[in-house]
């Protein structure tokens, strides 16, 4: 399986909410001997590999933000801790998973990574990740709403998030 990032860049005004999204692609085994661990974290563009570094998002670690379930089941992060930090990660039945960040500040700008770990009984884990950039802007040059830019494999025209 692979992870797709529909958008590689999100440009948002300060104070706005944004939902960063990843999508699980390819055959996903829904059997009971496979489970998926999905999470989010901040990172840096490493020389060898993007997303190798794992930094917290608003003081919450990737472990605080994880979703853990089988196949394409829906799931949400434990609400209290995440919501106190204006965060919520979620996953649906179609392989989409996301993190919503509320009331953005300039400090939220940076590289964000989604991670999926496929876990099978008596097997090594299979890890895949996706990366996207969030730019939070302020002042007269800031957009009035978040503007999202598709990843290079998709239409290059920018799309304004609803």
């Amino acid at each position: 399986f692979k992870v797709a990032t529909p958008y590689s860049l999100y440009v948002c005004p300060e104070g706005q909410n944004v939902t960063l999204t990843c999508r699980l692609l390819g055959p996903v085994d829904k059997g009971h001997d496979v489970t998926f661990y999905k999470t989010w974290y901040r990172s840096s563009r490493g020389e060898v590999q993007t997303c190798s570094e794992r930094r917290p998002i608003r003081n919450l670690t990737f472990q605080d933000l994880h979703l853990h379930h089988g196949g394409h089941q829906a799931a949400n992060t434990s609400h209290d801790l995440a919501q106190r930090h204006g965060l919520e990660s979620a996953s649906d039945h179609h392989g989409n998973f996301s993190i919503t960040m509320r009331n953005l500040t300039l400090l939220d700008s940076g590289l964000y990574c989604c991670l999926v770990v496929e876990i099978r009984h008596h097997h090594s884990e299979h890890r895949v990740h996706g990366a996207m950039e969030l730019q939070v802007q302020t002042g007269k040059d800031a957009p009035s709403n978040c503007v999202v830019y598709p990843s290079s494999s998709q239409d290059s025209e920018n799309i304004t998030a609803a």
Epitope: Y37, E53, E125
Partner: antibody, heavy 118, light 107 residues
Framework: QVQLQQSGAELMKPGASVKISCTAT????????IEWVKQRPGHGLEWLGE????????NYNEKFKDKATFTADTSSDTAYMQLSSLTSEDSAVYYC???????????WGAGTAVTVSS | DIVMTQSHKFMSTSVGDRVSITCKAS??????IAWYQQKPGQSPKLLIY???YRFTGVPDRFTGSGSGTDFTFTISSVQAEDLAVYYC?????????FGGGTKLDIK
Amino acid sequence: QVQLQQSGAELMKPGASVKISCTATGYTFSSCWIEWVKQRPGHGLEWLGEILPGSDYTNYNEKFKDKATFTADTSSDTAYMQLSSLTSEDSAVYYCARRPPGWYFDVWGAGTAVTVSS
Amino acid sequence: DIVMTQSHKFMSTSVGDRVSITCKASQDVSTDIAWYQQKPGQSPKLLIYSASYRFTGVPDRFTGSGSGTDFTFTISSVQAEDLAVYYCQHQYSTPWTFGGGTKLDIK
């Protein structure tokens, strides 16, 4: 604060079995692997295997698959390792450690010393 | 199984010195390695993950580098409290294996 509390030291007879416990606090127990590591004086660290509580997925080091058995009880957030048919070679300190999937051994217990002696 | 080889079992250094410990994997492990510190009478502690990133709360005198099969762990200015055994470990595929350890002695 994430912590792993291990059971106390054990003095065992050759041929006996011992069950070591590792109780987790401060995180969702079922979301991380519990790793088991052996350390004999002058022998460094040896990975015995791992269990993912809740799913009971396990991976054993081939060398220890007939020696160690891993179980976990999610109602008490405790993982167990049973060592069977003990010999002097099994005298060691045994550590449990937490490993989030796709990650490293980020929190370790204090270790349980097992001594096998007649 | 992937074998992790730390060529030096012992290294002697003085406070303030720079010291580097090497680790070689028997096959390509990308950057999927960690370095652990084990002080006398204590359990190991994660210092470096993904070959070059410091774990939470680890002082910046500790650094890691390398990819593929050759890795280096460096303490830029050794402190008395750095007396410990240092282990590399790969996290590429099970079974996870550790290097034999390098004991750092402070002169």
